[in-house]
């Protein structure tokens, strides 16, 4: 983008392609099928002057590329930035033996400011550039590249000024952008470690050793220092201070944690909050230990909530249709704090004359969509013996199950496998409405197939669409259903259960409760 | 000045065969593929296919294989286009096209003036 | 095979308008698309690759770009040598022409 660019402090640009207005005019050799310069577009649709070369055919290429005088600024070592792209050789057909992959960085100190030809003897090789990643075709979107940064320093340097030069052996290449810069080492203090202004080294070789000193509450594995490197950074310290476990950095110092507050290591982090159901109770807490019947799960942050076991799911309901059963449930009441709730099935065969006596049911037992690890409140099982009584066992997990298990995070069903359930029941009334409760009755199933051992309804809101629904078991034709709210639509359905499992549920009847007492009766149908 | 000089119009009869030649200068004629291009009468552009000049290695479009045959004369900086068993339906200008390779796309940049191969009984 | 659809078929325009040419592509070709100009009796001439770079010395009043399946070549002024056809070109494993777009004069 041309314009200036902002860079770090402690960088003094002596030369930016990018900050160009126009042609950047270097000098080519070859002058012509060599590097050529061409302007595309970046993001923003500014042009970019770049030079490319793309002479892969051939073997034995030598086509350089030198850039304009760049003036020293008394800096006697130089950082050299390019960012370029570089097609990969895959990508061009026919021309494994001749293309490559890198291509050379050259200098030449110089007190002329205008030296109009390029003399490869006069040129001192920096290095050899090679791309981090090159791309194939596919990878250039709509002016979207894949940019390699590679950074270079050369020096001492004594002259007045240097060029710059590229060597191009047979790559397909494109210089987008070549920044040369010089570096001051700044003052710093860093990590609670104080380090004073430090003025850089004469040469490579003269490092300045600088001394930090720790803050109160802070701990150093070895005496924090910095060397000061000619190249006006600050060479990775040797040691270092970091706030102490329970502590964290308040205006330069380490501070103990508050109550209800911990920090689990020397870290540069601040003190956090006790997770939900967990706590702290001194000051200075490294860790936070979570309440009774809460707990962590293995891959579970120390930031994160203690959580607990879901409890039972609700509501189960089982299809049984000769010898497959469906069964359906509700979510739990409380899914113990977490988002991992899944479901295992556990099928258990047992015995006819001692239910007592189960066994697992094999695996020649089908699930869909699967026996364990459901995220679904369903479940088909199929293949099952015929004439044999099966007591299926729902388990509502979580990622802390294992550390708690109990049977109260289970619920069960016993049916029967190969009998036929009961029809449905044709027809249900509402014998008495009030303001909070129906008394509903009905006719045993045209076809009870067996001895009927009770009626389950199941009952809802009409504008919840079945969404939380409950159930009501009786073993009579009747029963009331109480705690209703007044002025509301409910839907019942009823159905029958004998040894062989549950029928269909009858055709909805729609009851609206009301304000004053009165008997209604229904016919299967919707009554108000 | 880089060009390409392809030879002047040819008619031909059904079942006979025609070279054409396409003569580049201005450049090295090893450092650049050569593409061929057929166009019909009134038609559009067909690539036919290119060739490696530095080994000599074709490649054909779909549909151009069999009778077509692309060659080299690198003493000469020539490329050919053979066509054999010439059809009614071969009858169409053919261009051959220097192919460039960069790193932000590739392109014919520069072409010949074209050949009309007429076949007709 | 990659097949490339350019529309409109003819564009009218008259000389210093604007003109848009498209290039829609059957799958992604990236940015792997060439555009060229072919006069009568002349042979064609490469405006641009790579989607939207233009070779030295087309004029900058040729701009295009695009990249996947949808592409499109921009005339800022139509100058009168520019009534000609143009042609889309997609480069991958095999390579493959448009049908052209003739620009006329309105």
């Known amino acids: 983008v041309t314009g200036s660019r902002v860079y770090p402090a402690n960088e003094v640009t002596l030369l930016d392609s990018r900050s160009v207005q126009g042609e950047l005019g270097w000098i080519a050799s070859p002058l012509e099928g060599g590097w050529e310069e061409v302007s595309i577009m970046d993001e923003k649709n500014t042009p970019i002057r770049t030079y490319q070369v793309c002479n892969v055919m051939e073997a034995s290429q030598n086509n350089w590329l030198r850039t304009d005088w760049i003036t020293r600024e008394g800096a006697q070592r130089v950082y050299i930035e390019i960012k370029f792209t570089l097609r990969d050789c895959n990508s061009l057909p026919g021309v494994m033996g001749t293309c490559k992959e890198t291509f050379n960085l050259y200098y030449y100190e110089s007190d002329n400011d205008k030296e109009r030809f390029i003399r490869e003897s006069q040129f001192g090789k920096i290095d050899t550039i090679a791309a981090d990643e090159s791309f194939t075709q596919v990878d250039i979107g709509d002016r979207i590249m894949k940019l390699n940064t590679e950074i270079r320093d050369v020096g001492p340097l004594s002259k007045k000024g240097f060029y710059l030069a590229f060597q191009d052996v047979g790559a397909c290449i494109a210089l987008v952008s070549v920044r040369v810069f010089y570096k001051k080492c700044p003052l710093t203090v860093r990590n609670l470690a104080q380090f004073p202004d430090t003025i850089t080294g004469a040469d490579t070789s003269s490092l300045v050793e600088v001394r930090g000193s720790c803050v109160n509450n802070s701990e150093e594995k070895d005496v924090p220092k910095m060397y000061c490197g000619a190249d006006g950074e600050w060479l990775v310290p040797i040691g270092n201070c970091l706030c102490n476990a329970g502590h964290e950095e308040q205006n330069g110092e380490c501070q103990a944690c508050k109550i209800g507050y911990y920090k689990a290591l020397s870290t540069d982090a601040s003190c956090a909050k006790c997770p939900p159901h967990s706590y702290s109770v001194w000051e200075g807490a490294t860790s936070c230990t979570c309440d009774r019947g809460f707990f962590r799960a293995d891959n579970d942050a120390a930031s994160m909530p203690c959580t607990r076991p879901p409890s039972a799911p609700l509501n189960l309901i089982s299809n049984v249709n000769e010898t497959s059963v469906n069964l359906e449930w509700s979510s739990p009441q409380n899914t113990g704090g977490r988002q991992d709730i899944s479901y295992n099935v556990v099928c258990k065969k047992c015995g006819a004359g001692d239910p007592s006596k189960c066994r697992p049911c094999g695996s020649g037992v089908h699930y869909t969509p699967q026996q364990n690890g459901l995220k679904t409140t369903r479940v088909s099982i199929t293949d099952l013996l015929a004439h044999t009584n099966y007591t299926f066992e729902i388990w509502a997990v979580n990622g802390v199950s294992k550390y708690n298990p109990s049977p109260d995070q289970s619920v069960s069903v016993t049916v029967t496998t190969n009998q036929a359930a009961p029809s449905s029941i044709a027809l249900v009334q509402a014998k008495e409405v009030t303001r909070y409760s129906v008394a509903l009755a009905w006719l045993e199933p045209d076809r009870p197939n067996g001895v009927i051992l009770e009626y389950e309804v199941k009952y809802y809101e009409k504008d919840q669409n079945e969404r939380s629904y409950r159930i009501v078991r009786t073993a009579a034709r009747n029963t009331d259903i109480k705690g209703l709210n007044p002025l509301t639509s409910y839907v019942f359905h009823v159905r029958a259960r004998t040894a062989a499992g549950y029928g269909d549920f009858s055709e909805p009847l729609e009851v609206t409760t009301n304000t004053v007492p009165s008997r209604i009766i229904g016919d299967g149908a919707n009554s108000t | 000045q880089v060009q390409l000089l392809q030879s002047g119009a040819e008619v031909k009869k059904p079942g006979a065969s025609v070279k054409v030649p396409c003569k580049a200068s201005?450049?090295?004629?090893?450092?650049?593929?050569m593409s061929w291009v057929r166009q019909a009468p009134g038609q559009g552009l067909e690539w036919m296919g290119w060739?490696?000049?530095?080994?000599?290695?074709?490649t054909y479009a779909q549909g151009f294989t069999g009778r077509f045959v692309f060659s080299l004369d690198t003493s000469v900086s020539t490329a050919y286009l053979q066509i054999s068993s010439l059809k009614a339906e071969d009858t169409a200008v053919y261009y051959c096209?220097?192919?460039?390779?960069?790193?932000?796309?590739?392109?014919?940049?520069?072409w010949g003036q074209g050949t009309l191969v007429t076949v007709s009984s | 095979e990659i097949v490339l659809t350019q529309s409109p078929a003819t564009l009218s325009v008259s000389p210093g308008e604007r003109a848009t040419l498209s290039c829609r592509a059957s799958?992604?070709?990236?940015?792997?698309l060439a555009w060229y100009q072919q006069k009568p009796g002349q042979a064609p001439r490469l405006l641009i690759y790579?989607?939207?770079t233009r070779p030295t010395g087309i004029p900058d009043r040729f701009s295009a770009s695009g990249s996947g399946t949808d592409f499109t070549l921009t005339i800022s002024r139509v100058e009168p040598e520019d009534f000609a056809v143009y042609y889309c070109?997609?480069?991958?494993?095999?390579?493959?022409f448009g049908q052209g777009t003739k620009v006329e004069i309105k």
């Open positions: 096209a220097r192919v460039r390779f960069t790193v932000y796309g590739d392109g014919m940049d520069v």
């Open positions: 201005g450049y090295t004629f090893t450092s650049r593929a």
């Open positions: 060739i490696n000049t530095n080994t000599g290695n074709p």
């Open positions: 799958q992604s070709v990236s940015s792997n």
């Open positions: 790579g989607a939207s």
């Open positions: 070109q997609q480069y991958g494993p095999s390579w493959t």
